[in-house]
Interface confidence: medium
Amino acid sequence: FERTRSLQDPCSNCPAGTFCDNNRNQICSPCPPNSFSSAGGQRTCDICRQCKGVFRTRKECSSTSNAECDCTPGFHCLGAGCSMCEQDCKQGQELTKKGCKDCCFGTFNDQKRGICRPWTNCSLDGKSVLVNGTKERDVVCGPSPADLSPGASSVTPPAPAREPGHSPQ
Protein backbone atom coordinates (compact mmCIF):
# COMPACT_ATOMS: atom_id res chain seq x y z
CA PHE A 1 0.00 0.00 0.00
CA GLU A 2 2.81 2.40 0.92
CA ARG A 3 4.52 1.76 -2.41
CA THR A 4 1.30 2.31 -4.31
CA ARG A 5 0.71 5.50 -2.36
CA SER A 6 4.16 6.84 -3.18
CA LEU A 7 3.63 6.09 -6.88
CA GLN A 8 0.33 7.99 -6.81
CA ASP A 9 1.45 10.77 -4.50
CA PRO A 10 4.95 12.13 -5.00
CA CYS A 11 4.50 14.18 -1.83
CA SER A 12 4.78 11.08 0.31
CA ASN A 13 8.50 10.96 -0.56
CA CYS A 14 9.18 14.36 1.03
CA PRO A 15 10.99 13.81 4.35
CA ALA A 16 10.59 15.73 7.60
CA GLY A 17 12.15 19.17 7.31
CA THR A 18 10.72 19.64 3.82
CA PHE A 19 7.35 20.29 2.23
CA CYS A 20 5.81 19.24 -1.05
CA ASP A 21 5.85 22.42 -3.11
CA ASN A 22 2.80 22.56 -5.39
CA ASN A 23 4.18 25.70 -7.03
CA ARG A 24 7.30 23.81 -8.14
CA ASN A 25 5.86 20.61 -9.62
CA GLN A 26 5.49 18.94 -6.24
CA ILE A 27 9.20 18.74 -5.57
CA CYS A 28 10.40 18.57 -1.97
CA SER A 29 11.52 22.02 -0.84
CA PRO A 30 13.27 22.71 2.48
CA CYS A 31 11.15 24.42 5.12
CA PRO A 32 11.72 28.19 5.05
CA PRO A 33 13.44 29.86 8.02
CA ASN A 34 11.37 29.87 11.24
CA SER A 35 9.26 26.93 10.11
CA PHE A 36 9.41 23.14 10.44
CA SER A 37 7.79 19.86 9.43
CA SER A 38 8.10 17.03 11.91
CA ALA A 39 6.71 14.34 9.58
CA GLY A 40 7.17 13.41 5.94
CA GLY A 41 4.68 14.09 3.17
CA GLN A 42 3.69 17.56 4.43
CA ARG A 43 2.27 20.09 1.97
CA THR A 44 3.20 23.01 4.20
CA CYS A 45 5.66 23.67 7.00
CA ASP A 46 4.39 24.88 10.36
CA ILE A 47 5.50 28.20 11.81
CA CYS A 48 7.92 27.82 14.73
CA ARG A 49 6.66 28.70 18.17
CA GLN A 50 8.12 31.96 19.46
CA CYS A 51 9.13 32.30 23.10
CA LYS A 52 8.29 35.90 24.00
CA GLY A 53 7.41 37.87 27.09
CA VAL A 54 7.94 35.77 30.21
CA PHE A 55 8.55 32.70 28.07
CA ARG A 56 12.15 31.85 27.21
CA THR A 57 13.52 29.41 24.65
CA ARG A 58 14.29 25.99 26.09
CA LYS A 59 14.91 24.36 22.71
CA GLU A 60 15.47 26.18 19.44
CA CYS A 61 13.26 25.42 16.46
CA SER A 62 14.85 23.21 13.80
CA SER A 63 13.60 22.26 10.34
CA THR A 64 12.14 19.06 11.83
CA SER A 65 10.97 20.10 15.32
CA ASN A 66 9.20 23.02 16.93
CA ALA A 67 10.79 25.33 19.47
CA GLU A 68 10.03 24.63 23.13
CA CYS A 69 9.52 27.34 25.72
CA ASP A 70 9.80 27.46 29.47
CA CYS A 71 9.40 30.42 31.82
CA THR A 72 11.88 33.07 32.86
CA PRO A 73 13.13 33.02 36.47
CA GLY A 74 10.37 34.04 38.86
CA PHE A 75 7.72 32.18 36.85
CA HIS A 76 6.78 28.53 36.35
CA CYS A 77 5.03 26.68 33.53
CA LEU A 78 1.34 25.88 33.41
CA GLY A 79 -0.46 23.67 30.96
CA ALA A 80 0.58 21.14 28.35
CA GLY A 81 3.81 22.18 26.67
CA CYS A 82 4.10 25.22 28.96
CA SER A 83 1.17 27.09 27.45
CA MET A 84 1.39 29.84 30.07
CA CYS A 85 3.62 31.12 32.87
CA GLU A 86 2.56 31.84 36.44
CA GLN A 87 4.42 33.94 39.01
CA ASP A 88 6.48 32.06 41.59
CA CYS A 89 6.07 32.69 45.30
CA LYS A 90 8.56 31.81 48.03
CA GLN A 91 8.39 28.60 49.99
CA GLY A 92 5.98 29.24 52.85
CA GLN A 93 3.68 31.29 50.60
CA GLU A 94 0.86 30.79 48.12
CA LEU A 95 -0.30 32.89 45.20
CA THR A 96 -3.65 34.59 45.91
CA LYS A 97 -5.65 37.23 44.09
CA LYS A 98 -3.68 39.83 46.05
CA GLY A 99 -0.28 38.35 45.22
CA CYS A 100 2.00 36.11 47.28
CA LYS A 101 0.78 35.63 50.86
CA ASP A 102 2.33 33.73 53.77
CA CYS A 103 0.76 30.39 54.65
CA CYS A 104 -1.68 30.62 57.56
CA PHE A 105 -0.69 28.98 60.84
CA GLY A 106 -1.17 25.24 60.56
CA THR A 107 -0.43 25.13 56.83
CA PHE A 108 2.75 24.91 54.77
CA ASN A 109 4.07 25.04 51.21
CA ASP A 110 7.50 23.58 50.49
CA GLN A 111 7.48 24.72 46.83
CA LYS A 112 7.53 28.02 44.93
CA ARG A 113 4.18 27.18 43.35
CA GLY A 114 0.87 25.70 44.44
CA ILE A 115 -1.19 26.22 47.55
CA CYS A 116 -0.56 25.99 51.29
CA ARG A 117 -1.61 22.60 52.66
CA PRO A 118 -2.50 21.64 56.24
CA TRP A 119 0.14 20.07 58.43
CA THR A 120 -0.18 16.32 58.85
CA ASN A 121 -2.32 15.42 61.87
CA CYS A 122 0.00 12.93 63.58
CA SER A 123 -2.61 11.90 66.15
CA LEU A 124 -4.83 10.43 63.41
CA ASP A 125 -2.18 7.74 63.03
CA GLY A 126 -1.71 7.43 66.78
CA LYS A 127 1.64 9.18 66.54
CA SER A 128 3.08 12.27 68.20
CA VAL A 129 4.71 15.36 66.72
CA LEU A 130 8.45 14.84 66.62
CA VAL A 131 9.32 18.08 64.79
CA ASN A 132 6.94 21.04 64.70
CA GLY A 133 5.67 22.29 61.35
CA THR A 134 6.55 25.65 59.86
CA LYS A 135 5.21 27.70 56.95
CA GLU A 136 7.73 25.92 54.74
CA ARG A 137 7.71 22.41 56.18
CA ASP A 138 5.19 19.81 57.32
CA VAL A 139 5.36 18.42 60.83
CA VAL A 140 7.42 15.28 61.31
CA CYS A 141 5.49 12.53 63.06
CA GLY A 142 7.22 10.17 65.43
CA PRO A 143 6.16 7.15 67.43
CA SER A 144 3.52 7.65 70.08
CA PRO A 145 4.90 8.03 73.64
CA ALA A 146 3.81 4.46 74.40
CA ASP A 147 6.01 3.19 71.59
CA LEU A 148 9.12 4.90 72.88
CA SER A 149 11.15 2.00 74.17
CA PRO A 150 14.75 0.96 73.48
CA GLY A 151 15.03 -0.11 69.87
CA ALA A 152 11.83 1.64 68.91
CA SER A 153 12.21 2.85 65.43
CA SER A 154 11.90 5.39 62.90
CA VAL A 155 10.37 8.67 62.04
CA THR A 156 7.51 8.68 59.53
CA PRO A 157 8.44 10.99 56.65
CA PRO A 158 5.85 13.57 55.68
CA ALA A 159 3.48 12.70 52.87
CA PRO A 160 4.87 13.70 49.47
CA ALA A 161 3.85 17.18 48.40
CA ARG A 162 0.87 17.11 46.06
CA GLU A 163 1.52 18.86 42.79
CA PRO A 164 -1.35 21.28 42.05
CA GLY A 165 -3.28 20.71 38.86
CA HIS A 166 -1.87 22.70 36.01
CA SER A 167 -4.20 23.76 33.28
CA PRO A 168 -3.80 25.80 30.14
CA GLN A 169 -5.19 29.25 29.99
Epitope: Q87, P164, P168
Partner: antibody, heavy 118, light 107 residues
Protein backbone atom coordinates in the same frame (compact mmCIF):
# COMPACT_ATOMS: atom_id res chain seq x y z
CA UNK B 1 -18.28 22.09 19.46
CA UNK B 2 -17.23 24.58 22.14
CA UNK B 3 -20.11 26.60 23.56
CA UNK B 4 -20.20 29.24 26.29
CA UNK B 5 -23.56 30.63 27.40
CA UNK B 6 -23.76 33.49 29.90
CA UNK B 7 -26.77 34.31 32.08
CA UNK B 8 -27.67 36.33 35.16
CA UNK B 9 -27.42 39.85 33.75
CA UNK B 10 -30.05 42.49 34.44
CA UNK B 11 -30.80 45.83 36.04
CA UNK B 12 -29.39 46.46 39.50
CA UNK B 13 -29.13 49.55 41.71
CA UNK B 14 -25.75 51.09 42.62
CA UNK B 15 -24.31 49.28 45.62
CA UNK B 16 -26.24 46.13 44.73
CA UNK B 17 -25.04 42.66 43.82
CA UNK B 18 -25.45 40.27 40.92
CA UNK B 19 -24.10 36.82 40.07
CA UNK B 20 -23.33 35.93 36.47
CA UNK B 21 -23.08 32.34 35.27
CA UNK B 22 -21.45 30.84 32.21
CA UNK B 23 -22.39 27.30 31.16
CA UNK B 24 -19.62 25.62 29.19
CA UNK B 25 -19.84 22.60 26.89
CA UNK B 26 -17.88 20.90 24.13
CA UNK B 27 -14.52 20.75 25.93
CA UNK B 28 -12.99 19.50 29.16
CA UNK B 29 -13.91 22.51 31.27
CA UNK B 30 -11.60 21.76 34.21
CA UNK B 31 -8.56 21.78 31.91
CA UNK B 32 -8.83 25.46 31.10
CA UNK B 33 -8.29 28.86 32.65
CA UNK B 34 -11.47 30.86 32.10
CA UNK B 35 -11.85 34.63 31.79
CA UNK B 36 -14.46 37.33 32.13
CA UNK B 37 -14.16 40.30 29.75
CA UNK B 38 -16.58 43.22 29.69
CA UNK B 39 -17.58 45.94 27.26
CA UNK B 40 -19.34 49.13 28.32
CA UNK B 41 -21.92 50.44 25.83
CA UNK B 42 -20.12 51.99 22.85
CA UNK B 43 -16.73 51.35 24.47
CA UNK B 44 -13.85 48.92 24.10
CA UNK B 45 -13.09 45.53 25.63
CA UNK B 46 -11.79 45.37 29.20
CA UNK B 47 -10.31 42.23 30.74
CA UNK B 48 -11.92 41.64 34.17
CA UNK B 49 -10.80 38.38 35.76
CA UNK B 50 -9.43 34.87 35.24
CA UNK B 51 -9.55 31.64 37.22
CA UNK B 52 -7.34 28.56 36.99
CA UNK B 53 -8.71 25.18 35.92
CA UNK B 54 -8.88 23.87 39.48
CA UNK B 55 -10.28 27.17 40.80
CA UNK B 56 -7.42 27.59 43.27
CA UNK B 57 -5.90 30.69 41.62
CA UNK B 58 -7.80 33.83 40.68
CA UNK B 59 -6.69 37.18 39.25
CA UNK B 60 -8.51 40.49 38.81
CA UNK B 61 -8.24 43.81 37.03
CA UNK B 62 -7.56 46.68 39.45
CA UNK B 63 -10.94 48.22 38.61
CA UNK B 64 -12.87 45.31 40.17
CA UNK B 65 -10.45 44.00 42.84
CA UNK B 66 -12.15 43.51 46.19
CA UNK B 67 -15.66 43.82 44.70
CA UNK B 68 -15.86 40.96 42.20
CA UNK B 69 -15.20 37.27 42.86
CA UNK B 70 -14.64 34.73 40.11
CA UNK B 71 -15.35 31.06 40.86
CA UNK B 72 -16.20 27.83 39.08
CA UNK B 73 -17.98 24.54 39.65
CA UNK B 74 -16.23 21.95 37.51
CA UNK B 75 -18.84 19.32 38.33
CA UNK B 76 -21.42 21.58 36.64
CA UNK B 77 -19.10 22.95 33.92
CA UNK B 78 -20.04 26.43 35.08
CA UNK B 79 -18.09 29.65 35.60
CA UNK B 80 -19.38 32.40 37.92
CA UNK B 81 -18.76 36.08 38.55
CA UNK B 82 -20.11 37.42 41.85
CA UNK B 83 -20.34 41.20 41.56
CA UNK B 84 -20.79 43.24 44.75
CA UNK B 85 -20.83 47.00 45.47
CA UNK B 86 -21.79 47.63 41.86
CA UNK B 87 -21.21 51.07 40.36
CA UNK B 88 -22.63 52.83 37.30
CA UNK B 89 -19.29 52.30 35.54
CA UNK B 90 -19.73 48.52 35.83
CA UNK B 91 -22.58 48.76 33.29
CA UNK B 92 -21.44 46.56 30.40
CA UNK B 93 -21.95 43.41 28.41
CA UNK B 94 -20.03 40.69 30.28
CA UNK B 95 -18.45 37.95 28.19
CA UNK B 96 -17.16 34.66 29.48
CA UNK B 97 -14.21 33.52 27.38
CA UNK B 98 -11.58 30.88 26.94
CA UNK B 99 -8.81 33.13 25.68
CA UNK B 100 -5.93 32.06 23.48
CA UNK B 101 -2.83 30.68 25.15
CA UNK B 102 -0.05 28.84 23.35
CA UNK B 103 -1.63 25.82 21.59
CA UNK B 104 -5.15 26.72 22.75
CA UNK B 105 -8.14 28.05 20.83
CA UNK B 106 -10.11 31.17 21.59
CA UNK B 107 -13.83 31.03 22.35
CA UNK B 108 -16.32 33.63 23.61
CA UNK B 109 -19.89 33.52 24.78
CA UNK B 110 -22.46 35.92 23.35
CA UNK B 111 -22.46 38.03 26.52
CA UNK B 112 -24.97 39.13 29.13
CA UNK B 113 -25.87 42.77 29.79
CA UNK B 114 -25.49 44.22 33.29
CA UNK B 115 -27.04 47.66 33.86
CA UNK B 116 -26.26 49.50 37.09
CA UNK B 117 -28.67 52.38 37.50
CA UNK B 118 -30.99 53.91 40.06
CA UNK C 1 0.48 46.90 32.63
CA UNK C 2 1.28 47.98 29.08
CA UNK C 3 -1.10 50.54 27.57
CA UNK C 4 -2.19 49.90 23.98
CA UNK C 5 -3.11 52.77 21.65
CA UNK C 6 -5.15 52.32 18.45
CA UNK C 7 -6.47 54.97 16.04
CA UNK C 8 -10.19 55.49 16.67
CA UNK C 9 -11.06 55.04 12.99
CA UNK C 10 -9.60 53.92 9.68
CA UNK C 11 -11.28 54.25 6.28
CA UNK C 12 -10.50 52.25 3.16
CA UNK C 13 -11.96 51.82 -0.31
CA UNK C 14 -13.15 48.33 -1.28
CA UNK C 15 -10.31 46.25 -2.73
CA UNK C 16 -7.65 48.43 -1.13
CA UNK C 17 -5.37 47.57 1.80
CA UNK C 18 -6.35 48.61 5.32
CA UNK C 19 -3.71 48.89 8.03
CA UNK C 20 -4.63 49.23 11.70
CA UNK C 21 -1.86 50.00 14.18
CA UNK C 22 -1.54 49.14 17.85
CA UNK C 23 1.17 50.96 19.77
CA UNK C 24 2.62 50.07 23.15
CA UNK C 25 5.95 50.21 24.90
CA UNK C 26 8.10 47.39 23.47
CA UNK C 27 4.99 45.56 22.27
CA UNK C 28 7.24 43.56 19.91
CA UNK C 29 8.45 41.56 22.89
CA UNK C 30 4.89 40.37 23.61
CA UNK C 31 2.31 38.29 21.75
CA UNK C 32 -0.39 40.29 19.96
CA UNK C 33 -3.85 39.05 19.00
CA UNK C 34 -6.43 40.89 16.92
CA UNK C 35 -10.22 40.65 17.29
CA UNK C 36 -12.96 41.63 14.90
CA UNK C 37 -16.28 42.67 16.42
CA UNK C 38 -19.45 43.45 14.51
CA UNK C 39 -22.41 45.25 16.14
CA UNK C 40 -24.29 43.11 18.65
CA UNK C 41 -21.85 40.21 18.31
CA UNK C 42 -19.05 38.75 20.41
CA UNK C 43 -15.45 39.39 19.32
CA UNK C 44 -13.87 36.95 16.86
CA UNK C 45 -10.17 36.17 16.87
CA UNK C 46 -8.62 36.96 13.47
CA UNK C 47 -4.89 36.94 14.32
CA UNK C 48 -2.97 35.41 17.23
CA UNK C 49 0.73 35.15 18.13
CA UNK C 50 1.41 38.34 16.10
CA UNK C 51 0.78 36.84 12.67
CA UNK C 52 -1.02 33.48 12.91
CA UNK C 53 -4.48 33.08 11.38
CA UNK C 54 -7.05 30.78 13.02
CA UNK C 55 -8.73 28.33 10.67
CA UNK C 56 -11.67 29.88 8.87
CA UNK C 57 -10.15 33.38 8.78
CA UNK C 58 -9.53 34.58 5.18
CA UNK C 59 -5.94 34.91 3.94
CA UNK C 60 -6.43 38.63 3.38
CA UNK C 61 -5.96 39.12 7.15
CA UNK C 62 -2.33 39.28 8.26
CA UNK C 63 -0.42 40.66 11.22
CA UNK C 64 3.04 41.87 12.14
CA UNK C 65 4.64 43.01 15.37
CA UNK C 66 7.99 44.62 16.12
CA UNK C 67 9.41 47.42 18.20
CA UNK C 68 6.60 49.54 19.64
CA UNK C 69 3.96 48.82 16.99
CA UNK C 70 1.82 45.87 15.94
CA UNK C 71 -0.14 46.09 12.70
CA UNK C 72 -3.20 44.31 11.37
CA UNK C 73 -3.28 44.37 7.55
CA UNK C 74 -6.38 43.55 5.52
CA UNK C 75 -5.52 43.18 1.82
CA UNK C 76 -8.28 43.53 -0.74
CA UNK C 77 -10.69 44.81 1.90
CA UNK C 78 -14.30 43.74 1.43
CA UNK C 79 -17.53 45.35 2.64
CA UNK C 80 -18.01 42.52 5.15
CA UNK C 81 -14.73 43.52 6.86
CA UNK C 82 -16.37 46.69 8.18
CA UNK C 83 -16.25 46.25 11.97
CA UNK C 84 -14.45 47.29 15.12
CA UNK C 85 -10.97 45.79 15.57
CA UNK C 86 -9.21 45.35 18.90
CA UNK C 87 -5.62 44.45 19.57
CA UNK C 88 -4.69 42.51 22.69
CA UNK C 89 -1.24 41.95 24.13
CA UNK C 90 -0.15 39.01 26.22
CA UNK C 91 3.29 38.36 27.72
CA UNK C 92 2.66 34.68 28.41
CA UNK C 93 1.47 35.21 31.98
CA UNK C 94 -2.05 35.54 33.31
CA UNK C 95 -3.74 38.87 32.66
CA UNK C 96 -4.62 40.44 29.32
CA UNK C 97 -4.62 44.01 27.97
CA UNK C 98 -6.84 45.28 25.15
CA UNK C 99 -6.42 48.32 22.95
CA UNK C 100 -9.16 50.92 22.72
CA UNK C 101 -10.45 49.64 19.38
CA UNK C 102 -10.51 50.94 15.80
CA UNK C 103 -13.64 51.36 13.69
CA UNK C 104 -12.89 50.22 10.14
CA UNK C 105 -15.13 51.85 7.53
CA UNK C 106 -15.22 50.43 4.02
CA UNK C 107 -16.13 53.38 1.81
Amino acid sequence: QVQLVESGGGLVQPGGSLRLSCAASGFTFSDYYMHWVRQAPGKGLEWVSVISGSGSNTYYADSVKGRFTISRDNSKNTLYLQMNSLRAEDTAVYYCARLYAQFEGDFWGQGTLVTVSS
Amino acid sequence: DIELTQPPSVSVAPGQTARISCSGDNIGSKYVSWYQQKPGQAPVLVIYSDSERPSGIPERFSGSNSGNTATLTISGTQAEDEADYYCQSWDGSISRVFGGGTKLTVL
